[in-house]
Interface confidence: medium
């Protein structure tokens, strides 16, 4: 899709290297429930399973973020046992949080991007054959 | 670990509910580059598939967010072939954007939720057997 | 409560193209697999298509495949099946059906159907 | 592609009475059996997955049972309301492939 120019010319795009440093916001967030159906069973019953864990951090907006680190090297088969011959591999995506930009902390904080590994997927690894 | 409270009293933990509604935010992100290595294949090599579409939104930071969508219902087997005793599944991460509040947009911004899937895994379906 | 609403059935000739609607409420849909599921005059029951939650991959039986185009808007909560070139043997009832938790294989709700005939 | 074969295609029962709707794949299908009931006039309903598992709000006198090739449905102390066609359903390989269904009456 073409980028939509905004209405007003004063406000550069947010994608823009001219994206204003400084603004406001408004922490009522939308989509506060953004409904999803809980797939709390999918880090089991994946091929590539996974554990959660829990990185908290007070300073941070949300200050609770689910990692998630993969159980096994391989990807389990058929009969439940691990087979080495895949890799399980961590799904990972970069997010946004908001940062306290001090201690003393003024209602001003700093966006700041983290990557996290949202969950594993079963992949097949890659041979080099020489010659 | 245990909350750690912040030195100003003044100052209301970020997950708490007197978490400030207005804040000044500083756009210079931190950890601009997160240094992740790039996981390009692992959406063709995992035996769940998926392609990455791109969702573009000129009003919203980041404007551009890549979403996956599983390429099969069930997961690719040994042979290449798609087997349906399998399911591709995606895995959603619910991320935090910034939305622009209004057309004519003084620097403010609210804070929105979005669900995003960032890859499939491939998952045994739930089939319930007794005794 | 889960509802399913299909639209869009009618007398249709031989080779002849319809495309079928259906509009969810109730549930996030979003998050489910959909599918189309026809019943013929005779009272047999057909899996036609499914299409996981997020529109990424879609099955459908040799009888149908290369005819029949399953699709969704999430964003409308609707599903849609597109039908060409039509046989007198795509006479039936089709049902929007949703599928069973996370995997697309079982149907735990339907719609009340829409006709669709096939005849010259 | 797996044939599913319900024998009788109609069963006629007492009230209060039990009956047993049988099912027969031309294959192994390891339990990945689902139930159907549908009233006349009226959509399919989902009864039981998984060969034996009820769904939510289905009354406790319906039970699944079976293994590899065969499978029933059970009906114990018959309601007016189970006049129905019941069809099983085999989700272990596709097309996902129904019986015929059984059609039953009250004597």
């Known amino acids: 899709a073409g980028i939509v120019i905004p209405q007003n010319p004063e406000c550069p795009n947010t994608g823009d290297k001219n994206f204003p440093q400084n603004v406001k916001i408004n922490l009522n967030v939308l989509n506060r429930k953004t409904n999803s159906r809980r797939a709390s069973d999918y880090h089991n019953r994946s091929t590539s399973p996974w554990n959660l864990h829990r990185n908290e951090d007070p300073e941070r907006y949300p200050s609770v973020i689910w990692e998630a680190k993969c159980r096994h090297l391989g990807c389990v088969n058929a009969e439940g046992k691990v087979d080495f011959h895949m890799n399980s591999v961590p799904i990972q995506q970069e997010i946004l949080v908001l940062r306290r930009e001090s201690q003393n902390c003024p209602h001003s904080f700093q966006l700041e991007k983290m990557l996290v590994a949202v969950g594993c997927t079963c992949v097949t690894p890659i041979v080099r054959h020489m010659g | 670990a245990g909350i750690v409270i912040p030195q100003n009293p003044e100052c209301p933990n970020t997950g708490d509910k007197n978490f400030p509604q207005n804040v000044k935010i500083n756009l210079n992100v931190l950890n601009r580059k997160t240094n992740s290595r790039r996981a390009s294949d692992y959406h063709n090599r995992s035996t769940s598939p998926w392609n990455l579409h791109r969702n573009e939104d000129p009003e919203r930071y980041p404007s551009v967010i890549w979403e996956a969508k599983c390429r099969h219902l069930g997961c690719v087997n040994a042979e290449g072939k798609v087997d349906f005793h399998m399911n591709s599944v995606p895995i959603q991460q619910e991320i935090l954007v910034l939305r622009r509040e209004s057309q004519n947009c003084p620097h403010s911004f609210q804070l929105e939720k979005m669900l995003v899937a960032v890859g499939c895994t491939c998952v045994t379906p739930i089939v319930r057997h007794m005794g | 409560e889960v509802q399913l609403v299909e639209s869009g059935g009618g007398l249709v000739q031989p080779g002849g193209s319809l495309k079928l609607s259906c509009a969810a409420s109730?549930?996030?849909?979003?998050?489910?697999?959909m599918s189309w599921v026809r019943q013929t005059p005779d009272k047999r029951l057909e899996l036609v298509a499914i299409i996981n939650s997020n529109g990424g991959s879609t099955y459908y039986p040799d009888s149908v495949k290369g005819r029949f185009t399953i699709s969704r808007d999430n964003d409308k909560n609707s599903l849609y099946l597109q039908m060409s070139s039509l046989k007198s043997e795509d006479t039936a009832m089709y049902y929007c059906?949703?599928?069973?938790?996370?995997?697309?294989?079982?149907?735990?709700?339907w719609g009340q159907g829409t006709t669709l005939t096939v005849s010259s | 592609d797996i044939q599913m074969t319900q024998s009788s295609s109609y069963l006629s029962v007492s009230l209060g009475g039990r009956v047993t709707i049988t099912c027969k794949a031309n294959?192994?299908?390891?339990?990945?059996l689902a139930w159907y009931q549908q009233k006349p006039g009226n959509a399919p309903r989902l009864l039981i997955s998984?060969?034996?598992s009820l769904e939510t709000g289905v009354p406790s006198r319906f039970s699944g049972s079976g293994s590899g090739k065969d499978y029933t449905l059970s009906i114990t102390s018959l309601q007016t309301e189970d006049v129905a066609t019941y069809y099983c359903?085999?989700?272990?390989?596709?097309?996902?492939?129904f019986g015929s269904g059984t059609k039953l009456e009250i004597k």
């Open positions: 998984g060969s034996t």
């Open positions: 109730g549930f996030t849909f979003s998050s489910y697999g």
């Open positions: 059906v949703r599928c069973h938790y996370d995997y697309e294989r079982v149907f735990d709700y």
């Open positions: 359903q085999q989700y272990w390989s596709t097309p996902f492939t």
């Open positions: 294959d192994h299908i390891n339990n990945w």
